[in-house]
């Protein structure tokens, strides 16, 4: 299996945005790569978002996706938006080298994303 590296822990910003790098050790010269972000929480795994891209080009997520990303060589910079405290969990990066054959699959160990909902601002007395 292809090795995929990602940070162990990331803290989301107060605006609910978390970014991390997913890096894969490509065994071949892939031209088309598929990246999927999976969320594991309470032993349940769900797909957060997925994108296919040509090497050297931008990642194309669906219009309604909460993810955006850019690629550079064998690195993918992923950003997940709109996160709330309930979205805290392990976010796993899955990379598939689709074309040309052969197919390679790599799954990272996951990035624990912590999301803290901001405290509501107290009313100001003037």
């Amino acid at each position: 299996a292809m090795h995929v590296a990602q940070p162990a822990v990331v803290l989301a910003s107060s605006r609910g945005i978390a970014s991390f790098v997913c890096e894969y050790a490509s065994p071949g010269k892939a031209t088309e790569v598929r990246v999927t972000v999976l969320r594991q929480a309470d032993s349940q795994v769900t797909e957060v978002c997925a994108a296919t891209y040509m090497m050297g080009n931008e990642l194309t997520f669906l219009d309604d996706s909460i993810c955006t990303g850019t690629s550079s060589g064998n690195q993918v910079n992923l950003t997940i938006q709109g996160l709330r405290a309930m979205d805290t969990g392990l976010y796993i990066c899955k990379v598939e080298l689709m074309y040309p054959p052969p197919y390679y699959l790599g799954i990272g160990n996951g990035t624990q994303i912590y999301v803290i909902d901001p405290e509501p601002c107290p009313d100001s007395d003037f």
Epitope: Y53, Y99, P101, Y103
Partner: antibody
Framework: EVQLVESGGGLVKPGGSLRLSCAAS????????MAWVRQAPGKGLEWVAF????????YYADTETGRFTISRDNAKNSLYLQMNSLRAEDTAVYYC???????????WGQGTTVTVSS | DIQMTQSPSSLSASVGDRVTITCRAS??????LNWYQQKPGKVPKLLIY???RLHSGVPSRFSGSGSGTDFTLTISSLQPEDVATYFC?????????FGGGTKVEIK
């Protein structure tokens, strides 16, 4: 039910051109890579060309590179093969096939016959 | 290109017989070996992919085995409807290539 229907075959003179079409239904076309495979009369199967689901990747058999162009229109659920500079040895039944599993063709159309003859 | 060599090119067997078709690749193709069935005058159909996985709707009398360069398609009990030409195909590297086919007939 997955359905693939080819059209556009016919008789053409050497050096001529043809455009084959394949209309897909019964599945989400934009999720799948597609291929063209041909079979000369009484012969075996020969892979011709492949295009990935979003058309990012396109590949051809060596003998077809430069003469054939595979393309797709996901909005129309359609696959195409533009064939130029046709030769007698291109005479075959041309099948369109879905690449539903990595590098295997899981559903095939009924085929369209291309005859190159003077 | 990876060459795929099938044997025999044709065979004749009785209903109920166990039939074995072999396919040899000119280099290691890992598990990217697929089998197709083409009945006379009909369209090819995927039978088996990844060496041994049956495609949907394929009877369990069909099975696949092998590894690396040598692969086998087995029909455990030949039925009249199995009369067809069988092709192997490698998906390990482009161009994808097929074996020459094995024509199976009933005695």
């Amino acid at each position: 039910e997955v359905q693939l229907v080819e059209s556009g075959g016919g008789l053409v003179k050497p050096g001529g051109s043809l455009r084959l079409s394949c209309a897909a239904s019964g599945f989400t076309f934009s999720d799948y890579g597609m291929a063209w495979v041909r079979q000369a009369p009484g012969k075996g199967l020969e892979w011709v060309a492949f295009i990935s689901n979003l058309a990012y990747s396109v590949y051809y058999a060596d003998t077809e590179t430069g003469r054939f162009t595979i393309s797709r229109d996901n909005a129309k659920n359609s696959l195409y093969l533009q064939m130029n500079s046709l030769r007698a040895e291109d005479t075959a039944v041309y099948y369109c096939a879905r690449s539903g599993l990595p590098y295997a063709m899981d559903y095939w159309g009924q085929g369209t016959t291309v005859t190159v003859s003077s | 290109d990876i060459q795929m060599t099938q044997s025999p090119s044709s065979l004749s067997a009785s209903v109920g017989d166990r039939v074995t078709i072999t396919c040899r690749a000119s280099q290691d193709i890992s598990n990217y070996l697929n089998w197709y069935q083409q009945k006379p005058g009909k369209v090819p159909k995927l039978l088996i992919y990844y060496i041994s996985r049956l495609h949907s709707g394929v009877p369990s009398r069909f099975s696949g085995s092998g590894s690396g360069t040598d692969f086998t398609l087995t029909i455990s009990s030949l039925q009249p409807e199995d009369v067809a030409t069988y092709f192997c195909q490698q998906g390990r590297m482009l161009p994808w290539t097929f074996g020459g086919g094995t024509k199976v007939e009933i005695k």
